[in-house]
């Protein structure tokens, strides 16, 4: 029986040109994590393998950095980076656990404008 749960950073926003950390955490299971895949829609961004380490997809090499931990850092964000991101934990013997993060990339001025109205 799969008892684990994935906690994620949930819905997040960042400004164009900036960077963001995508983070998932698997808890409440004794299962052993053997690999974590990071995907954007159906595109593989990166793999963190327990034995072989990190592999970043060639098309994302310039803008994706491994870590911290099992997380993923996206750099030089564009509006096109807006969308769903998934962390897929391959675990023995439970199976796969999937976490979802929605990232919204805002134009710099929109992000700044929004900041003015934040409650201190």
């Amino acid at each position: 029986m799969m008892t684990g749960t994935i906690e994620t950073t949930g819905n997040i926003s960042a400004e164009k040109g900036g960077s963001i950390i995508l983070q998932c955490h698997l808890s409440s299971t004794t299962a052993q994590v053997t690999q974590v895949n990071w995907e954007q829609q159906d595109q593989l961004l990166a793999i963190c393998n327990a034995d072989l380490g990190w592999h970043i997809s060639p098309s994302f090499k310039d803008r994706v950095a491994p870590g911290p931990g099992l997380g993923l850092t996206l750099q030089s964000l564009t509006v096109n980076d807006t969308g769903e991101y998934f962390c897929i934990y391959h675990t023995y013997p439970d199976g796969t656990y999937t976490g979802r993060i929605f990232l919204e990339v805002l134009e710099s001025s929109v992000a700044e404008h929004g900041a003015r109205f934040q409650i201190p």
Partner: antibody, heavy 122, light 107 residues
């Protein structure tokens, strides 16, 4: 090369304890789960459970709780099976086996120890 | 728990024969199934994983197929060293049970 080498066969009296060791070499020990499998004479393979080599957390199959303990010494890349209060029905070959494969659909016991025969007899 | 039933339990065949061993799961296990070969007094050896992927170094006369609840191991042309016991195992969550085994004997 990747291998698991187990301790030698052991003859014990009922009520005694035994410890079987499984030394791994040729790979990163803490990256692959380790399993224990029992095979009684003339019988099939029975999965006893496994130990998370990253956290040291053991999981036991029903029927292998209480008297059976899985442990690790990661400094020497070794997994251990301890059986206490031995009974005649514990007489069997005990295997350690690594879970290979990185993704859920490719898991399998890809490397096995040679087996340790434990005989319990008065 | 998911139970695996292998059939037949015993199989009599001759060198050169094509033989098939079946493994049925009590519930759907996708393709999370492995096949092992065991010689008497030896450790099992992985033949097939993910239902149909041949393990490195295993002769191509061995093949696996199936998904869901029904799986098969086929040996296309039996060799003298193939007259041993075969086990299936599911790896679809805990516990990772084995089938009861199929012993292939010389006719």
């Amino acid at each position: 090369q990747v291998q698991l080498v187990q301790s030698g066969s052991d003859l014990k009296k009922p009520g005694a304890s035994v410890r079987v060791s499984c030394k791994a070499s040729g790979y990163t020990f803490t990256s692959y789960p380790m399993n224990w499998v029992r095979q009684a004479p003339g019988h099939g393979l029975e999965w006893m459970g496994w130990i998370n080599t990253n956290t040291g957390n053991p999981t036991y199959v029903q029927g292998f709780t209480g008297r059976f303990v899985f442990s690790l010494d990661t400094s020497v890349n070794t997994a251990y099976l301890q059986i206490s209060s031995l009974k005649a029905e514990d007489t069997a070959v005990y295997f350690c086996a690594r879970t290979g494969g990185h993704t859920y659909d490719s898991y399998a016991f890809d490397v096995w120890g040679q087996g340790t025969m434990v005989t319990v007899s008065s | 728990d998911i139970q695996l039933t292998q059939s037949p339990t015993f199989l009599s065949a001759s060198v050169g024969d094509r033989v098939t061993i079946t493994c049925r799961a009590s519930q759907v296990i996708s393709s999370s199934l492995a096949w092992y070969q065991q010689n008497p007094g030896k450790a099992p050896k992985l033949l097939i994983y993910a239902a149909s992927t041949l393990q490195s170094g295993v002769p191509s006369r061995f093949s696996g197929s199936g998904s869901g609840t029904e799986f098969t191991l086929t040996i296309s042309s039996l060799q003298p060293e193939d007259f041993v016991t075969y086990y299936c195992q599911h790896l679809h969550g805990y516990p990772c049970n084995f089938g009861q085994g199929t012993k292939v004997e010389i006719k």
